[in-house]
Every structure is written in structure tokens, then in C-alpha cells.
Interface confidence: low
């Protein structure tokens, strides 16, 4: 059975394709190639006479075709118009004609795509953003990447328009991207430059630092306010409800008891039109709000070296305090194996080593006073090495 095979089946525009012929009969007068699925003289590309080894171009010849003695047809510099069916007619010496039809598909070399957006400055929890991958081309697969990863499954992400459009429903501040689209066809692929979203949000509720409430007269009061916001928030300070200044930081040197009161930080985002405030009470006093003695506990007080870990916990009912840890009169942590967590309330040692044995205590403090826990003793044991099995020499 006479057959043809396209090499390759999917061809890039501008490249070449070879229509290979299999099972060509032995006794031939000649053969012809036609464009289309049937023999049509008006669509003949080329004829080849075996006897004269002469190729004759037909009406459909473009000058890019070459026919070989084995009947294979080479088409160079293909265009998308070349896509389709090709029919070979073989005229055998018994005057019985045999035909075979093959096909190939020409795809364009894809350009570098770009991303267009209907809104590059959306407002958090309010706006939707539709990204469209340009250009629109036939027989093209569209893929999307967020943060260099394929699209996560999310009810807020919707693909439409044959995946050419990616819609983000109700954007959040974490949706900044970058976003990339990739276009693919069977012969090429190309990815866009990344696009980022400038998501307008906030301000969130401001945080006033430091967290201290009590100050001694004569100290300097330096408060800083921060609220997550895009664009950055504009800040102003009020003391006991009276406007003071429009700055992110408030500094009052040499404070007196008259500086006690309610300190309000006001954060405003002029784009979202939202405002948030936080109020902090400052108490300037000679009296010490005495910090109670903290309690120290250990997950275990006797451990095996190089094997066990231990957690030490410092407990206090006081608020607005800080915690620090001591071991043999030295401040901790002192090694990579020591980690502080939960606002310094927990000291973890993993693994425990011989040099970790000894006395630990914690100290709670505020700007006015401090107090230490009773010490706790950590014992570190080492198991004897196991005996090696096997025969001893000699």
C-alpha cells in the first residue's frame, strides 16, 4: 500500500517539510504531486517522468518545491497557506494509478507575548483585574504563571477567552505577582516579560512602638507609628485628642508627669480614602509599677547530651514587659542551638551539649523595674559508648 509521511508533521513557518513516500511500486511511468485531497490538474505541483528523469512544474508550483527520484517532495520556506493535504498519484506501468494522501500543519514562530491589564492599580478587596495575553493567535495554547509558578487552584482566579484572559476576583495585597503569560503551539513557545500589580490597600490598624507604657520623668519619649499601607500612609499624632504634628515619629524630650495621657496615631491613605487609629496610654511616674517575680519551668531538668532537647519557659502575669535569659551570668542565646520564641518566653536548646549544664534564670523588666526568677539547674548526662561487636585481632 502506497503511503506518505510528513517529516515533521508540525512545521514552523519558514522551515521545510519533507513528504516521504513509502512502498513506492517498482514498475512506474511517473508520478505527480497535487495540493489537496484529490487529483486536480489545476492544483498540480510537479510531475516527474521516470524515463527522462524530468520534473515538470504544475500550476500550483511556487518554486519552493523539489521532487526526488524516490517520489518524496521537499517544500522549503513554508507558510501557513501551505497547511493542508497533499496527494501523490503514481502512474504504474500497467496503467493502474495508485494514490496516497498526506498532510502537515504549519504553525507560526510565536512572537514574544505581552500582558495587557484593565487595571494596574486595583484596590484591595474591591477591584477585579483582568489580564489579557497579547496577541490573539490561532492554534495557540495560553499558559499563565504567578511568581514563576503555574496557576494555583483558587476561586479568585478565573480563566476565560480560551485561557487568554486571567481574571483576579477581588484582589489582595498578596496578588502583586509577578505575572507572566506563555504562548505555545506545536513548534514554538514564548513567554512575556513579567508584569506586577500595584495593589492599593490599607492602612491597616497602626502599631505604636515601643510597647512601653511607664516612663520616668526626665526621660525622652520617642514613639513611632507604622501601618501597612500602599501607597504609604500619612501619619499624624494627637495627645489627649489634640493634634500635635503630621509625622510618623513623635519625640518629646525630658518628659514630666504632665506628659501622661492618651497618645493617638492616625494613619490615612489618600488613595483608598481609609483611616485607622491606635491609642496608647503613656504614664510618666516616679512610682515603680513593680514587676512580679517570674516563674521558670523546664520540660526536663536531666537530659542526655547530644540526644535530647529541652524547653525552658518563663511565666509572668505582668503585661508590657520584656524577657531576657541568663546562663552562668551570661546573656542568651549564646549558640546556634539556642532559640527564643513566643516573645522570648521560651528558650529551646536542641540538642543539649555538655557545656549547657548549669544554672539558668530569666528576668522580666519594663522601663521602670525588673525582677528575676529563681534559678533552675540543668543536668546533662552522657551515656557510655556501646561496645563494638566482632572479633578482636590476634
Amino acid at each position: 500500500q502506497l503511503t506518505t509521511e510528513s517529516m515533521p508533521f508540525n512545521v514552523a513557518e519558514g522551515k521545510e517539510v519533507l513528504l516521504l513516500v513509502h512502498n513506492l511500486p517498482q514498475q512506474l511511468f511517473g508520478y505527480s504531486w497535487y495540493k489537496g485531497e484529490r487529483v486536480d490538474g489545476n492544483r498540480q505541483i510537479v510531475g516527474y517522468a521516470i524515463g527522462t528523469q524530468q520534473a515538470t512544474p504544475g500550476p500550483a508550483n511556487s518554486g519552493r518545491e523539489t521532487i526526488y527520484p524516490n517520489a518524496s517532495l521537499l517544500i522549503q520556506n513554508v507558510t501557513q497557506n501551505d497547511t493542508g493535504f497533499y496527494t501523490l498519484q503514481v502512474i504504474k506501468s500497467d496503467l493502474v494509478n495508485e494514490e496516497a494522501t498526506g498532510q502537515f500543519h504549519v504553525y507560526p514562530e510565536l512572537p514574544k507575548p505581552s500582558i495587557s491589564s484593565n487595571n494596574s492599580n486595583p484596590v484591595e478587596d474591591k477591584d477585579a483585574v483582568a489580564f489579557t495575553c497579547e496577541p490573539e493567535t490561532q492554534d495557540t495554547t495560553y499558559l499563565w504563571w504567578i511568581n514563576n509558578q503555574s496557576l494555583p487552584v483558587s476561586p479568585r482566579l478565573q480563566l476565560s477567552n480560551g485561557n487568554r484572559t486571567l481574571t483576579l476576583l477581588s484582589v489582595t495585597r498578596n496578588d502583586t505577582g509577578p505575572y507572566e503569560c506563555e504562548i505555545q503551539n506545536p513548534v514554538s513557545a514564548n513567554r512575556s516579560d513579567p508584569v506586577t500589580l500595584n495593589v492599593t490597600y490599607g492602612p491597616d490598624t497602626p502599631t505604636i512602638s515601643p510597647s512601653d507604657t511607664y516612663y520616668r520623668p526626665g526621660a525622652n519619649l520617642s514613639l513611632s507609628c507604622y501601618a501597612a499601607s500602599n501607597p504609604p500612609a500619612q501619619y499624624s499624632w494627637l495627645i489627649n485628642g489634640t493634634f500635635q504634628q503630621s509625622t510618623q515619629e513623635l519625640f518629646i524630650p525630658n518628659i514630666t508627669v504632665n506628659n501622661s495621657g492618651s497618645y493617638t496615631c492616625h494613619a490615612n491613605n489618600s488613595v483608598t480614602g481609609c483611616n485607622r487609629t491606635t491609642v496608647k496610654t503613656i504614664i510618666v511616674t516616679e512610682l515603680s509599677p513593680v514587676v512580679a517575680k517570674p516563674q521558670i519551668k523546664a520540660s526536663k531538668t536531666t537530659v542526655t547530651g547530644d540526644k535530647d532537647s529541652v524547653n525552658l519557659t518563663c511565666s509572668t502575669n505582668d503585661t508590657g514587659i520584656s524577657i531576657r535569659w541568663f546562663f552562668k551570668n551570661q546573656s542568651l542565646p549564646s549558640s546556634e542551638r539556642m532559640k527564643l520564641s513566643q516573645g522570648n518566653t521560651t528558650l529551646s536548646i536542641n540538642p543539649v551539649k555538655r557545656e549547657d549544664a548549669g544554672t539558668y534564670w530569666c528576668e522580666v523588666f519594663n522601663p521602670i523595674s525588673k525582677n528575676q526568677s529563681d534559678p533552675i539547674m540543668l543536668n546533662v548526662n552522657y551515656n557510655a559508648l556501646p561496645q563494638e561487636n566482632g572479633l578482636s585481632p590476634g
Epitope: A128, P155, Q158, L159, S160, N161, G162, N163, T167, L169, S170
Partner: antibody, heavy 121, light 111 residues
Framework: EVQLLESGGGLVQPGGSLRLSCAAS????????MSWVRQAPGKGLEWVSV????????YYADSVKGRLTISRDNSKNTLYLQMNSLRAEDTAVYYC??????????????WGQGTLVTVSS | QSVLTQPPSASGTPGQRVTISCSGS????????VSWYQQLPGTAPKLLIY???RRPSGVPDRFSGSKSGTSASLAISGLRSEDEADYYC???????????FGGGTKLTVLG
Amino acid sequence: EVQLLESGGGLVQPGGSLRLSCAASGFTFSNYAMSWVRQAPGKGLEWVSVISHGGGSIYYADSVKGRLTISRDNSKNTLYLQMNSLRAEDTAVYYCARDPTKGYAPLFDYWGQGTLVTVSS
Amino acid sequence: QSVLTQPPSASGTPGQRVTISCSGSSSNIGNNYVSWYQQLPGTAPKLLIYADSRRPSGVPDRFSGSKSGTSASLAISGLRSEDEADYYCGAWDLSLNGYVFGGGTKLTVLG
């Protein structure tokens, strides 16, 4: 509890007008796209129109374009359907329905009980 | 003639599993989420399935949805007499720029 209560239905002559209202309660109305869906007697559901949560995006079924107008008043938590040039084929129970996707991939998670519009001479 | 095609009727006996199909095209089911609605006699429709296969809270897990290509289906297992109702599929259509429903399937619980 989410509640949608339609009103304004009734008997109207062909070519006449009617205004349907849908009073919403139990949720933040301005956060949701809203739709009108109708059902002719003994027939299936037919979507009529959708309006986005802020009112900026509106779509209509081809069968009602130019004759029916959807609108909303977020301050009153109310959805409206102004019906003009009414035809006999507009006879149906009209439901208002809430869309939790803000109209970007519409679906209807809460429905009113419907109000009957009869167009007849 | 509905854009989405459903069988007009389906039936089953109590305890059986019944499936209702919904056929569309790439402009609706193929590229958008499918929802299913249940309408009990004389009442307003109720959302049964959204986003192809998700169930709203309060909908029993006897109801399940699935989608493949341009077709979707609703399966009801452990059929009960109270499941007798009309069932509609729906999806946004990108070509029509509108929401389309199937013609509805009347489910009868026999016996």
C-alpha cells in the same frame, strides 16, 4: 439570615410598564452582584439580567435588551427591574437572586420567593 | 431551545443513584464554572452545586457534581422521595455575555 423579598408584580397590558423591587436583608448588599431570573408558567428558568456590586457592570439577556432595565440602590439595600414595552412572552414569575462572585463568574446562592408578572389584554 | 442541554426527565427508586447530564460548548461549560439548582414544586430554586463540584453548606453529600470538557453532570445517590424536583444546570456564556440555564430535568422518585 439572608432574605430577598420581591414586590411590584401584577397584571399589565401589552406595551405597558411595571417596576419590580427586591428588598435585601441579612447581608451586606453592596458587596454582592444581583440578578433577575424569570420562569414562565410551566417552563424552565431564564436569566434576565445581572448588575455588579457597585452598579458599574450590567448585562442583559438578548430577549429583554432595550426593554428591561436593572438598577440598584445600595443605600436602600434594594434591587430594581424597570419593565417597559411589555409583551405576552414576558409573563413569568420574576426572582431576584444573589451572586456571591461579584458578577465575574455568576451563580446564585440565595433566591427570593418571586413575584408574578402577567402581561395580558 | 436552551443553550445548555439537559434530559427533560429522569427517574429512580429510593436508594438508587441517578445522574443528570448537562451538555454545552467551549463558550460556556468548557471555559466557565457550572452550577446546579434544585427547584422543589411550588418553591424558589435552591443552589445545589457550584464551581462544578462544590457543595454549599447544608447540602447533603448525596449530591455531587462533575465536569469534563463541555459537559457536566449531577449525581444523586441514595435517592429519597424528597429529592423529587426540577434540576437545572447553569453557566456563564462568553459568547452571549450572559448566564444560561439548561432546560431543566424533572426527577421522579418511583414507588
